[in-house]
């Protein structure tokens, strides 16, 4: 391991569509991948009239967008489905939304998901 880098070996797993996809609904997912590639965790969610609905959480393959991110933060402005990724075991347990505005200061909408 490179000093200062959080290696990801497992992530929080959640699938809102678990019955249709024939998976578990929630748990811990071990992350697999090429030994030399980095692994990450992700979270996806929707904001339905101010109510947070988690879609999926799990492992994410090597992605430079996720490098050195210890927190799972969506920065895209008003996406249809929110997505964030991070490095470090279970780093996707909490996720938040900090849109990058071009002119105004970014606003903070931290999200702590309720357990299903």
């Amino acid at each position: 391991a490179i000093l200062g880098r959080s290696e990801t070996q497992e992530c929080l797993f959640f699938n809102a569509n678990w019955e249709k996809d024939r998976t578990n609904q929630t748990g811990v997912e071990p992350c697999y991948g090429d030994k030399d590639k980095r692994r990450h965790c992700f979270a996806t969610w929707k904001n339905i009239s101010g109510s947070i609905e988690i879609v999926k959480q799990g492992c994410w393959l090597d992605d430079i967008n996720c490098y050195d991110r210890t927190d799972c933060v969506e920065k895209k402005d008003s996406p249809e489905v929110y997505f964030c990724c991070c490095e470090g075991n279970m780093c996707n347990e909490k996720f938040s939304y900090f849109p990058e505005m071009e002119v105004t200061q970014p606003t903070s909408n931290p999200v702590t998901p309720k357990p299903p």
Epitope: D34, C59, W60, L61, D62, I64, N65, F83
Partner: antibody
């Protein structure tokens, strides 16, 4: 083992649309991106765009903006690329590739546009 | 993003070393370690050889190596073999906020 299997060759008339599929297996489909790349006969590789397989978020090359649509169906681990208003210079082999590094590629789908 | 610049062709004899360059700008190749190299044999799909400038993809021979200096990335193949004859493309990571771009390709001939 990781595999991306694409749909078969297509022949289309100018002005028509084509939809190419890319079925993934051997890994968790929703754990990365699917990129689409094309290669005209005797030419180089051209990046068309990408789709995040879990969120459905897309980014398209400027050249194809307004003409390309990338979608996916998580339940069958399949990504799709639809190109509309086809012209003769869209004749090419279309590839899907896994992840931001393009570490696995489909076998390619030849799309021929001819009147 | 404009295409990356590669030489159209390079050649070498078996056992020799060759280097293929890929020149971009300070805002792509110069700024990030996200250049990749692909090998493509005629009629086949491309194959990832090097990613992140210098990391060898799993299963790729250690005769292939990648490096970067300034705005130029390079692929070096040492101990050339007949099966190395192919087209080679450089390209960038694509996904999230990063848009992909490829070089024009370099035809490697093993004499």
């Amino acid at each position: 083992q990781v595999q991306l299997v694409q749909s078969g060759a297509e022949v289309k008339k100018p002005g028509a649309s084509v939809k190419v599929s890319c079925k993934a297996s051997g890994y968790t489909f929703t754990s990365s991106y699917i990129n689409w790349v094309r290669q005209a006969p005797g030419q180089g590789l051209e990046w068309m765009g990408t789709i995040n397989a879990v969120s459905g978020s897309t980014s398209y090359a400027q050249k194809f903006q307004g003409r390309v649509t990338m979608t996916r169906d998580e339940s069958i681990s399949t990504a799709y690329m639809e190109l509309s208003r086809l012209r003769s210079d869209d004749t090419a082999v279309y590839y899907c590739a896994r992840g931001g590094w393009f570490d696995y590629w489909g076998q390619g789908t030849l799309v021929t546009v001819s009147s | 993003q404009s295409a990356l610049t590669q030489p159209a062709s390079v050649s070498g004899s078996p056992g020799q070393s060759i280097t293929i360059s890929c020149t971009g700008t300070s805002s792509d190749v110069g700024s990030y370690n996200y250049v990749n190299w692909y090998q493509q044999h005629p009629g086949k799909a491309p194959k990832l050889m090097i990613y992140g400038v210098s990391k060898r993809e799993s299963g790729v021979s250690n005769r292939f190596s990648g490096s970067k200096s300034g705005n130029t990335a390079s692929l070096t193949i040492s101990g050339l073999q007949a099966e190395d004859e192919a087209d080679y493309y450089c390209g960038t990571f694509a996904g999230g906020k990063y848009y992909g771009v490829f070089g024009g390709g370099t035809k490697l001939t093993v004499l």
